[in-house]
């Protein structure tokens, strides 16, 4: 099995996670495309997915997640703008290929987003928080539902009120398409 | 350490072409996208484009599409850019540059030394 | 094609707070990083992520975002610090700001 590796975001409240996923370009250029929450003991929550197939360079926005696919460079690019303490958790890309299982996108992220000052070596102290804003969703594709055997001996996810983000513009508990896909071994 | 070390300079005659290598010693090479960054004399920073070296793709500035081509030889963890159809307003410092992590496009933490390529008939 | 517009050019006296802004259309959803490019040498990074100093980075230099411009921010001014800036922010290419000399009076 391949190692899972994770890289490690520290931000704060009302910063941009910016990160890229790369993927193998003739393979999946135009494949259907996600970005999901691992909570513990839960399987893997898709918060938001490129339309299919999926289109170059067309930003795809559910809440404060935009997902820009770039076929041409063979990378999935995701920020979550505005972000929220509630954010902080475990993300993975993922491709969907069916009728087989996902295709998980390396590396992981480990998002740590902090209140105020994160004091952390290497940040400043005196640095004022953005306070930038984005406009309401613009586009939201449908995510696909998967089910799969693995799935049904697991226990289904204690709630969808813990992707909640109570203090940004939209709250994620509204979208109604988050999907529940295989935990990757 | 990360270190990227470049080769000499160059000098060319307009029409010419020139191939740059950026060689990578300190990390997998094949994790961290390698970007080139040129500064004409007196100028500023004027990004080229970047290279995967786990795939070989790579993205252009729009401003040298057809022109430049980036390249790596992973056995060697060295990348090439070659520009062609060299011009007087070519003449610049050619740098290379690591990102900082594997699943970030910016920023650059690691930087070449730089490389002088003169275009003069 | 995105830009980031930076001022030329930026005074200081030894001591005192210099302040070198970068701006751009949605700057506020993109991370800016700021680099620091003495004469004859490659350029060095800064800050990232829009606030966080790299190890080996005096804490002097700081950063901030407010809307869609970003602050580099260098208190104690040195004359050490007299030098080319360059912000940094990634559109659907990595763009760098025009630049602002840094004058140490």
């Known amino acids: 099995a391949t190692k899972l590796t994770e890289e490690k975001y520290e931000l704060k409240e009302g910063q941009t996670l910016d990160v890229k996923c790369d993927y193998t370009l003739e393979k999946f250029a135009s494949s259907q495309k996600a970005w999901q929450i691992i909570r513990d003991g839960e399987m893997p929550k898709t918060l938001a997915c490129t339309e299919r197939p999926s289109k170059n360079s067309h930003p795809v926005q559910v809440g404060r997640i935009i997902l820009e696919d770039y076929h041409d460079h063979g990378l999935l690019r995701v920020r979550m703008v505005n972000l929220q303490v509630e954010d902080s958790g475990l993300y993975q890309c993922v491709i969907y290929q069916p009728p087989k299982e996902p295709h998980m996108l390396f590396d992981r992220i480990r998002l740590v987003v902090t209140k105020g000052f994160s004091g952390t070596p290497g940040s400043n102290e005196n640095s004022t928080q953005n306070v930038y804003k984005i406009p309401p969703t613009t586009t939201k594709a449908l995510c696909p539902l998967y089910t799969s055997p693995r799935t049904v001996t697991q226990a289904p996810p204690k709630s969808t009120a813990d992707v909640s983000t109570p203090d940004s513009e939209i709250n994620l508990t509204n979208v109604t398409d988050i999907i529940r896909v295989p935990v990757f071994n | 350490q990360v270190q990227l070390v470049q080769s000499g300079a160059e000098v060319k005659k307009p029409g010419a072409s020139v191939k740059v290598s950026c060689k990578a010693s300190?990390?997998?090479?094949?994790?961290?996208?390698i970007h080139w960054v040129r500064q004409a004399p007196g100028q500023g920073l004027e990004w080229m484009g970047w290279?995967?070296?786990?795939?070989?793709?790579?993205n252009y500035a729009q401003k040298f599409q057809g022109r430049v081509t980036m390249t790596r030889d992973t056995s060697i963890s060295t990348a090439y850019m070659e520009l062609s159809r060299l011009r007087s307003d070519d003449t610049a410092v050619y740098y290379c540059?690591?990102?900082?992590?594997?699943?970030?496009?910016?920023?650059?933490?690691?930087w070449g030394q730089g490389t002088l390529v003169t275009v003069s008939s | 094609s995105y830009e980031l517009t930076q001022p030329p050019s930026v005074s200081v006296s030894p001591g005192q707070t210099a302040s070198i802004t970068c701006s751009g259309d949605?700057?506020?959803?993109?991370?800016v990083a700021w680099y620091q490019q003495k004469p004859g040498q490659s350029p060095v990074l800064v800050i990232y992520?829009?606030?966080k100093r790299p190890s080996g980075i005096p804490e002097r230099f700081s950063g901030s975002k407010s809307g869609n411009t970003a602050t580099l921010t260098i208190s104690g001014t040195q004359a050490m610090d007299e030098a080319d800036y360059y912000c940094?922010?990634?559109?659907?290419?990595?763009?760098f700001g025009g630049g602002t000399k840094l004058t140490v009076l």
């Open positions: 540059a690591r990102d900082q992590r594997k699943t970030t496009v910016t920023p650059f933490e690691y």
């Open positions: 300190g990390y997998t090479f094949n994790g961290y996208y």
């Open positions: 290279l995967n070296p786990n795939s070989g793709g790579a």
């Open positions: 949605k700057l506020g959803e993109r991370n």
């Open positions: 992520q829009d606030n």
């Open positions: 940094q922010a990634w559109d659907r290419n990595v763009v």
